[in-house]
């Protein structure tokens, strides 16, 4: 069941899913200058059986200028509007990611992917919070939020995290935060993330396929 609202906003914090629950959808759009082929799926879908989960559908984009040219690109949508962005670097060892049953990993970046990824989360999804660079985490409990459904309405639980002005950035779960997930990612940022159910991550291929440069959307 799709979450029809957004994870909570925590001042001076950002969130990330470290794995995507089956049913999660990822918008399949193309970067500027490319468009999705007419027969192409508008989404990738995390699907699976009891033993394995993976992203269904391939995104195919064709150059807007050259009609006959098609390229496969990662299913990342173009920004709907111009927004300020800031970059953060994160080492991500895909092979070392823990495989959670019923979950898909972050799809790897492909050539010519668009500027942002928009995910549509489902009930049961957990996202993890960390303070942005220059802020330190004060915890009252887990720095995570879970999408739950009550009386047919979806809601996200409130993460027990306060970010206070310090010099040291806090880490994603597993990077010095004992109460949360063991397979999180270290990140640093300089502004408050607009947290949305369709979480947007801008990615580019860096030195290797295991190194992502994430640019996240801010306001």
């Amino acid at each position: 069941e799709l979450c029809d609202d957004d994870p909570p906003k925590i001042t001076h914090a950002t969130f990330k899913a470290v794995a995507y629950k089956e049913g999660t959808m990822l918008n399949c759009e193309c970067k500027r200058g490319f468009r999705r082929i007419k027969s192409g799926s508008p989404y990738m879908l995390c699907t699976g059986n009891s033993s394995h989960s993976s992203w269904d559908n391939q995104c195919q984009c064709t150059s807007s200028a050259a009609r006959n040219t098609t390229k496969q690109v990662t299913p990342q949508p173009e920004e709907q509007k111009e927004r300020k962005t800031t970059e953060m670097q994160s080492q991500m060892q895909l092979a070392d990611q823990v495989s959670l049953p019923g979950h898909c990993r972050e799809p790897p970046p492909w050539e010519n992917e668009a500027t942002e990824r928009i995910y549509h989360f489902v009930v049961g999804q957990t996202v993890y919070y960390q303070c942005v660079q220059g802020y330190r985490a004060l915890h009252r409990g887990p720095a995570e939020s879970v999408c739950k459904m009550t009386h047919g309405k979806t809601r996200w639980t409130q993460p027990q995290l306060i970010c206070t002005g310090e010099t040291e950035p806090s880490q994603f779960p597993g990077e010095e935060e004992p109460q949360a997930s063991p397979d999180g990612l270290p990140e640093s940022e300089t502004s408050r993330l607009v947290t949305t159910t369709d979480f947007r991550i801008q990615t580019e291929v860096a030195a290797t396929m295991e190194t992502f440069i994430f640019t996240t959307e801010y306001q």
Partner: antibody
């Protein structure tokens, strides 16, 4: 109490555009997505898309991506759906419905008739 | 897209009858939701998350099912129940509805 009040019926010429409004009251407008659903005469319900009023983010049913444009005005707690290049097959009742999960509140519907 | 197929399309029944409407989804879904619509009116939420009754809905309505097969049952049809019923899935985009089942007077 929660209310969604839509604009009145419209009669339009083929090729023209129409903008249907949906004014929300009784709840925090920016806390819920606003969805739009179409019902052609004697037909079933079709989901068209939604908007997040707080950010203007929209998601569309691909079938209506080139037909409908959904917007919202936070200052007046109003969502809009504009239909372009109208054709006779766009004749339908258009409903707004509050999201956040199941559609628990609906507007009364706006009949758009496209006729030459 | 997930296709929702309701059966029957039209159901003729009398007050007091037990009425069953089925909805089949083309792919597995988490939950089914049901709406009731009367002529000239907006749809009204009837049952959510497969089996939960919406506020103010009489206990004669019930829902069941899982996976791809779901059922709406009216245990004893009342005059106010003559209407069109729609199943609805919101497990994946685009959100889809069944084509509707019209319950009419026999």
């Amino acid at each position: 109490q929660v209310q969604l009040v839509q604009s009145g019926a419209e009669v339009k010429k083929p090729g023209s555009s129409v903008k249907v409004s949906c004014k929300a009251s009784g709840y925090t407008f920016t806390s819920y997505r606003m969805h739009w659903v179409r019902q052609a005469p004697g037909q079933g319900l079709e989901w068209m898309g939604y908007i997040k009023p707080s950010r203007g983010y929209t998601e569309y049913n691909q079938k209506f991506k080139d037909k409908a444009t959904i917007t919202a005005d936070e200052s007046t707690n109003t969502a809009y759906m504009e239909l372009s290049s109208l054709r006779s097959e766009d004749t339908a009742v258009y409903y707004c419905a509050r999201g956040g999960g199941v559609f628990d509140y609906w507007g009364q519907g706006t009949l758009v008739t496209v006729s030459s | 897209d997930i296709q929702m197929t309701q059966s029957p399309s039209t159901l003729s029944a009398s007050v007091g009858d037990r009425v069953t409407i089925t909805c089949s989804a083309s792919s597995k879904i988490s939950y089914m939701h049901w709406y009731q619509q009367k002529p000239g009116k907006a749809p009204k939420l009837l049952i959510y998350t497969t089996s939960d009754l919406a506020s103010g809905v009489p206990a004669r309505f019930s829902g069941s099912g899982s996976g791809t097969e779901f059922t709406l049952t009216i245990s004893s049809l009342q005059p106010d129940d003559f209407a069109t019923y729609y199943c609805h899935q919101r497990s994946t985009y685009p959100l889809t509805f069944g084509q509707g089942t019209k319950v009419e007077v026999k």
